[in-house]
Interface confidence: low
């Protein structure tokens, strides 16, 4: 039987010869050369070589554990002479022992990791970690031990984990934002003789809302017109916050002073400025300076720094409101003013009153907008604005005159102001009433006495008071012997009544009735209208059958026939 | 800073009607009266109507080539100014600007100038 | 209603004075503001109120208004100045605008 099982060898031979790795031996070697072994299987001939006399191996290279850790072979032994085995072939290792000839190499070259400022000791930054291709179950070629050797007394790292945590209270971003910490993991434990690799760990403080925004004066001064509508930007503010991104976002509002109602602030995002607005129209003459107390704060507040104070600051904002030439206004929005129709030229109407809002109250004059009164039928006062007929008016015409009167600044015409005077046309009887329209009527020869031939109507351009009250009447020259009469309803209405029984068309054809229609106002205005009748043949239902045509062709007028 | 950007514009049939838009940014819009100018092409400005501000009653003035025709409106809670264009007419062709009535400049009631203008929107009016 | 009438073109050499007038009977009752455009651009607001000249408006610009003219002043024409300019003004709440005269700088 075979006298070995398994051989050990060192790996990494530096010797001059080749490494001795052991005897392949069978009990049937009497030593007399009779017998031949042969080696096969992993490196058998190129890496293993074996004395085929004496089973003496030996490795021609050298041996890298790392690389192969095992070496799987088969042993034979033969009879030299009858070439037939004395042993059944037979497998057998060997192993290569470690040496500790790797270093520990971490799984990055640099690390980068963040931690925010002002952190706790002993926060968790980042875990580094090494490998050691050593052999780990023997010795301790491959037991790692970690330190720093570079980012004391800031940061530390557990030698076991390479855990690296905090090791400095108040770590201030503002103050420094970088760190650079370099690590070295070494084997044997750490101990003397141990083979090392490092790495670099670059650290960035990340920011925590610590510092409170600042103004960097307490008093601020802006100047806007009084003209500014709401809205308008005055001017800017700025605090200053040493912090970053979200915590370094401010809110303005104004807190105090006496034009809390009259501007706002508004904040940029993009600036983180305060922008100090007209809330309110601003008026010179009333009121020329404002003080606000403007507030800039973090509207994201991390609690645990509340101790370091309130995350606010104040400043006083100054605001000048400076004086505009505004132009003149009037002192009403419209003015309406009323004028008798029969009143004379240069009859004065009323008035209207402008001046001057500034300070310096410039005088001013007054004018008629002449595209308002083409035909200049108004005058104005240039001084005291009173309104006078320039030419005389009527009613009936026009009742309503719609002008524009213009204040002008009598220093600086360019500042004007307009406003519209309703002027109203009062009535005055100054129109006759008329007929309403041409009356032309018929009557037949077999009319009874008192019969209602014709109704009549009349109008009145005038409109007064009470309402119009009209009266109808024969002409005085037609009234005595009149074939016809005329009787007054008193409801602004009249009718015309046959006053005989029968006409006869051969002897009077056409009748002219001279009709008096007077008004009820003062002074009594009245005028004559004619009525035709024409006499006419009719059957016995009082339809009319036949007439003659001269009366069409006869003037308005009176009729002694009447 | 101050920005007017008009869209809308297009070629459209005599008769059509369209509708143009002025996006504002950069400034209060509802403190501000706006006017609509158009320029026919390689020719001068013509000024189509004006809306006040709504503090100052939000009316409308327009021209009268376009008087019962164009339609000026705003929405202050989107920003935009809008030009409603009916009965188009061929002599309507005109790049459209949109205009802000600059309040800070002069304090002379109607007579501010346009301190800002977008940069025209073509509307062709063709058969 | 108000009329603004100006010369269609002017020229001047660079660095001399270039006037450009407008004129109309309400001049002297109405504010006049002068717009600079050059092609394919929106008009930009160089003179308003006669004389005053916005922020960011080189001081060259400059602006008058006297008896029935109102005019647009450029000391020192410079080349970038070539554009179409614009006066306007505004009576009885309708605005108008004079026909334009094109600033051609010489050279």
């Known amino acids: 039987s075979w006298m070995w099982n398994q051989f050990f060898l060192l790996e990494e031979y530096t010797g001059s010869d080749y490494q001795y790795v052991g005897k392949l031996h069978s009990d049937q070697d009497r030593g007399d050369g009779s017998l031949k072994y042969i080696l096969s299987g992993d490196g058998a001939g190129d890496l293993f070589i074996i004395n085929e006399n004496t089973g003496d191996i030996q490795a021609t290279k050298r041996l890298d554990r790392e690389e192969k850790p095992v070496y799987i072979l088969r042993a034979q032994a033969i009879n030299r002479r009858t070439g037939r085995p004395v042993e059944p072939e037979s497998e057998f290792i060997i192993k290569i022992h470690d040496i500790n000839d790797n270093e520990p190499i971490f799984t990055k070259d640099v690390y980068t990791a963040t931690v925010p400022e002002m952190a706790d000791v002993g926060t968790f930054v980042v875990q580094v970690t090494a490998t050691d291709a050593d052999d780990p179950t023997y010795g301790n070629s491959a037991k790692v031990v970690y330190s720093i050797l570079q980012g004391q007394p800031y940061f530390s790292v557990e030698s076991e984990t390479g855990i690296i945590k905090t090791a400095l209270l108040n770590m201030d971003r503002e103050n420094r934002e970088q760190y650079q910490v370099v690590i070295q993991a070494k084997d044997m434990g750490g101990q003397m003789g141990g083979l090392s690799g490092t790495t670099t760990v670059n650290i960035t403080l990340t920011d925590v809302n610590d510092n409170p925004p600042r103004f960097p004066q307490s008093t601020y001064q802006f100047k806007t017109p009084e003209s500014s509508p709401p809205g308008t930007p005055i001017g800017r503010i700025k605090a200053s916050d040493a912090d970053v991104g979200e915590n370094a976002e401010i809110e303005y509002s104004i807190t105090d002073g006496e034009g809390h109602d009259m501007f706002d602030v508004i904040t940029d995002q993009e600036t983180q400025e305060g922008i100090i607005t007209v809330k309110k129209l601003l008026d010179f003459e009333k009121k020329r300076v404002y003080t606000l107390k403007v507030e800039a704060s973090n509207p994201h507040i991390e609690p645990r720094f509340l101790y370091l104070g309130p995350f606010k600051d104040s400043a006083t904002v100054r605001i000048v409101v400076d004086d505009v030439d505004e132009p003149p206004v009037f002192s009403k929005p419209a003015y309406i003013l009323q004028i008798r129709e029969d009143a004379q030229i240069n009859t004065t109407i009323g008035s209207v009153a402008a001046q001057d809002p500034d300070a310096a109250r410039n005088p001013v004059k007054y004018s008629v907008d002449r595209h308002t009164d083409m035909d200049r039928i108004f005058n104005i006062d240039s001084g005291n604005g009173s309104i006078f007929t320039s030419k005389l008016l009527d009613r009936e015409t026009l009742l309503w005159h719609n002008i524009t009167v213009i204040a002008t600044e009598i220093n600086n015409p360019k500042q004007s102001s307009r406003v519209p005077l309703y002027i109203k046309v009062l009535d005055v009887n100054d129109n006759a009433p008329e007929f309403a329209e041409f009356y032309e009527t018929f009557v037949c020869e077999k009319a009874k006495a008192d019969q209602l031939i014709q109704t009549l109507h009349a109008v009145d351009k005038d409109d007064p008071y009470s309402g119009h009250q009209f009266s109808f009447s024969l002409a005085p020259e037609a009234a005595s012997g009149s074939n016809f009469t005329i009787q007054d309803n008193k409801d602004n209405t009249a009718g015309i009544l046959t006053r005989k029984n029968g006409y006869n068309r051969h002897e009077m054809s056409t009748y002219l009735l001279p009709v008096v229609i007077s008004d009820n106002d003062y002074p009594v205005q009245s005028s004559t209208g004619t009525v035709t009748v024409r006499v006419c043949a009719c059957d016995h239902h009082g339809n009319m059958q036949s007439c003659h045509a001269e009366a069409l062709i006869h003037p308005t007028g009176l009729s002694t026939g009447a | 800073q101050v920005q007017l950007v008009e869209s809308g514009g297009g070629l459209v049939k005599p008769g059509g009607s369209l509708r143009l838009s002025c996006a504002a940014s950069?400034?209060?819009?509802?403190?501000?009266?706006l006017h609509w100018v158009r320029q026919a092409p390689g020719k001068g400005l013509e000024w189509v109507g004006r809306i006040k501000s709504k503090t100052n009653g939000g009316t409308t003035d327009y021209a009268a080539p376009v008087k019962g025709r164009f339609t000026i409106s705003r929405d202050d809670s989107k920003n935009t100014l809008y030009l409603q264009m009916n009965s188009l007419k061929t002599e309507d062709t005109a790049v459209y600007y949109c205009?802000?009535?600059?309040?800070?400049?002069?304090?002379?009631?109607?007579?501010?100038?346009?301190?800002?203008w977008g940069q025209g929107t073509l509307v062709t009016v063709s058969s | 209603d108000i009329e603004l009438t100006q010369p269609p073109s002017v020229s001047v050499s660079p660095g001399q004075t270039a006037s450009i007038t407008c004129s109309g009977d309400?001049?002297?009752?109405?504010?006049v503001h002068w717009y600079q455009q050059k092609p394919g651009q929106a008009p930009v607001l160089v003179i308003y109120d006669d004389n005053k000249r916005p922020s960011g408006i080189p001081e060259r610009f400059s602006g008058s208004n006297s008896g029935n003219t109102a005019t647009l002043t450029i000391s020192g024409t410079q080349a970038e100045d070539e554009a179409d300019y614009y006066c306007?003004?505004?009576?009885?709440?309708?605005?108008?605008f004079g026909g334009g005269t094109k600033l051609t700088v010489l050279g």
């Open positions: 309400k001049i002297p009752t109405y504010t």
């Open positions: 205009a802000r009535v600059d309040a800070t400049y002069s304090y002379s009631g109607y007579y501010y100038p346009m301190d800002y």
């Open positions: 950069g400034f209060t819009f509802n403190s501000y009266a």
């Open positions: 306007q003004s505004t009576a009885s709440g309708t605005v108008v």
